[in-house]
Interface confidence: low
């Protein structure tokens, strides 16, 4: 008996070849002996089976002695033994229909679990192997699970079902819904405009949801919602925004926020959450703001930074084109009685300058100028 594997929803062609290369009387029936399809001369006749509206045959091939049975929109319950009787010949084909589906949706939030479930006909004992877009192989029986989906899991998963030394391949497109970056940090001098961008790592035709940016300023005891917004078909509309700071938001994707000016009281960490329509859970991106201020008060030149800095960051004060006068892994440095000239305050990481602020120190009879 010939075995043919089919995929749920697909179309399958079961072949039946007569020894005589001409159109002769034939019919197909199932294991229940119910007629499915046959011919009346050069015309097709359909039997009373429940497949009635989903079966066909290639009439153009009858003259060559080929009597195919085409079953469209395959269902698991179509799995059966199909018998072709042509002239005095009889051919049997065992059709096994499999389905592979993602647990709920193929659009999953980062960190969620993906469960692939194999639907198979009774009496079959298939094995399944899936390969993720990043080349990771997983094996299983009726179900395969991948926990903690990552961004790299987005793409086409290729799954092979093996049964009776035959195989059928499924391709499932999985979209992991996440921001491109889990976290970002913006370094700004006091007074500068701040741009926060939250690019998504996926594209969908219609994107609807709502979001909010919560901000924990370093100086504040509790976090505060800075802005809430809606997203409808990739168009952004602001619902509510604080008066201080008054953030502005771009109307198109990627999500883009502008803080008119960086001030020490705004330095801190934010968490942008995006809840997508019909999805449980939220997308998150952390954003950090580090603000630098260089000031001269009487005989003291001070440089300070506010916000989430790593302990390995170095804060330095130096006179232009000279060695650093002071360099510390701290959030404030100062020089007493600084000599006149252009001073630079530098925040650096392993020699790479992240933020720089210049302040001109005038001879002692003048007041300082901040460029």
């Amino acid at each position: 008996k010939k075995v043919v594997l089919g995929k749920k929803g697909d179309t399958v062609e079961l072949t039946c070849t007569a020894s005589q290369k001409k159109s002769i009387q034939f019919h197909w029936k199932n294991s229940n002996q119910t007629k499915i399809l046959g011919n009346q001369g050069s015309f097709l006749t359909k039997g009373p089976s429940k497949l009635n509206d989903r079966v066909d045959s290639r009439r153009s091939l009858w003259d060559q002695g080929n009597f195919t049975l085409i079953i469209k929109n395959l269902k698991i319950e179509d799995s059966d033994t199909y018998i072709c009787e042509v002239g005095d010949q009889k051919e049997e084909v065992q059709l096994l229909v499999f389905g592979l589906t993602a647990n709920s949706d193929t659009h999953l939030l980062q960190g969620q679990s993906l469960t692939l479930t194999l639907e198979s006909p009774p009496g079959s004992s298939p094995s399944v192997q899936c390969r993720s877009p990043r080349g990771k192989n997983i094996q299983g029986g009726k179900t395969l699970s991948v926990s903690q989906l990552e961004l790299q899991d987005s793409g086409t998963w290729t799954c092979t079902v093996l049964q009776n030394q035959k195989k059928v391949e499924f391709k499932i497109d999985i979209v992991v819904l996440a921001f491109q970056k889990a976290s970002s940090i913006v370094y700004k001098k006091e007074g500068e405009q701040v741009e926060f961008s939250f690019p998504l790592a996926f594209t969908v035709e219609k994107l609807t949801g709502s979001g909010e940016l919560w901000w924990q300023a370093e100086r504040a005891s509790s976090s505060k919602s800075w802005i809430t917004f809606d997203l409808k078909n990739k168009e952004v509309s602001v619902k509510r925004v604080t008066q201080d700071p008054k953030l502005q938001m771009g109307k198109k994707l990627p999500l883009h926020l502008t803080l008119p000016q960086a001030l020490p009281q705004y330095a801190g960490s934010g968490n942008l959450t995006l809840a997508l329509e019909a999805k449980t859970g939220k997308l998150h991106q952390e954003v950090n703001l580090v603000v630098m201020r260089a000031t001269q008060l009487q005989k003291n030149l001070t440089c300070e930074v506010w916000g989430p800095t790593s302990p390995k960051l170095m804060l330095s004060l130096k006179l232009e084109n000279k060695e650093a006068k002071v360099s510390k892994r701290e959030k404030a440095v100062w020089v007493l009685n600084p000599e006149a000239g252009m001073w630079q305050c530098l925040l650096s990481d392993s020699g790479q300058v992240l933020l720089e602020s210049n302040i001109k120190v005038l001879p002692t009879w003048s007041t300082p100028v901040q460029p």
Partner: antibody, heavy 118, light 111 residues
Framework: QVQLVQSGAEVKKPGASVKVSCKAS????????ISWVRQAPGQGLEWMGE????????YYNEKFKGRVTMTRDTSTSTVYMELSSLRSEDTAVYYC???????????WGQGTLVTVSS | DIVMTQSPDSLAVSLGERATINCKAS??????????MNWYQQKPGQPPKLLIY???NLESGVPDRFSGSGSGTDFTLTISSLQAEDVAVYYC?????????FGGGTKVEIK
């Protein structure tokens, strides 16, 4: 203030097409969705579809798919609704309506009567 | 599509009396704690005017004698004290699911 001004009444023969315009003013044209809603004489209201003036993307009620086309001209802040293969049952007042915070239909045009008659 | 059924078709109420209009959706129009139901008033020869949005929120400029209530599938528009200028046709409309659908309308007259 927000204003939606529609083109004048039209009389069409069955099988013809009609194109109704809706000129928006008093707000940022690209910021709000504009819908088209029709009302047959003495009947209720029926949503035909909507257009996003920013992108030009439009979404239609299944009932009108294949017969309705919604377009926009950002240079004149005007939205157009074209209905083809007109039949007598398309005789109605056609309204454009702009969305707001609470609803899809906050601001309405004055309506355009389209009469389909042989 | 969600089917909206309004009752009654018409209503005659004395000036100063309460008028109540009901609307039933074929399926729930609730989402995330809100009911996506709006109410409109339409006078002859005029476009509809939004009165109530999201079941119970009064649109700006609408007199507070109008109120909306309900959730899930059953909603009510109430005019607490009918005025002469309230004579109109009132429509409910769901905005949860495309296509947005309207009720058949309720004509309010003075008794």
């Amino acid at each position: 203030q927000v204003q939606l001004v529609q083109s004048g009444a039209e009389v069409k023969k069955p099988g013809a097409s009609v194109k109704v315009s809706c000129k928006a003013s008093g707000y940022t044209f690209t910021a709000y969705v504009i819908s088209w809603v029709r009302q047959a004489p003495g009947q209720g209201l029926e949503w035909m579809g909507e257009i996003y003036p920013g992108s030009g993307s439009s979404y239609y009620n299944e009932k009108f798919k294949g017969r309705v086309t919604m377009t926009r001209d950002t240079s004149t802040s005007t939205v157009y609704m074209e209905l083809s293969s007109l039949r007598s049952e398309d005789t109605a007042v056609y309204y454009c309506a702009r969305s707001g915070d609470g609803s899809r239909f906050v601001y309405w045009g004055q309506g355009t009567l389209v009469t389909v008659s042989s | 599509d969600i089917v909206m059924t309004q009752s009654p078709d018409s209503l005659a109420v004395s000036l100063g009396e309460r008028a109540t209009i009901n609307c039933k959706a074929s399926q729930s129009v609730d989402y995330d704690g809100d009911s996506y139901m709006n109410w409109y008033q339409q006078k002859p020869g005029q476009p509809p005017k939004l009165l109530i949005y999201v079941a119970s929120n009064l649109e700006s400029g609408v007199p507070d004698r109008f109120s909306g209530s309900g959730s899930g599938t059953d909603f009510t528009l109430t005019i607490s004290s009918l005025q002469a200028e309230d004579v109109a046709v009132y429509y409910c409309q769901q905005s949860l699911q495309d296509p947005p659908t309207f009720g058949g309308g309720t004509k309010v007259e003075i008794k």
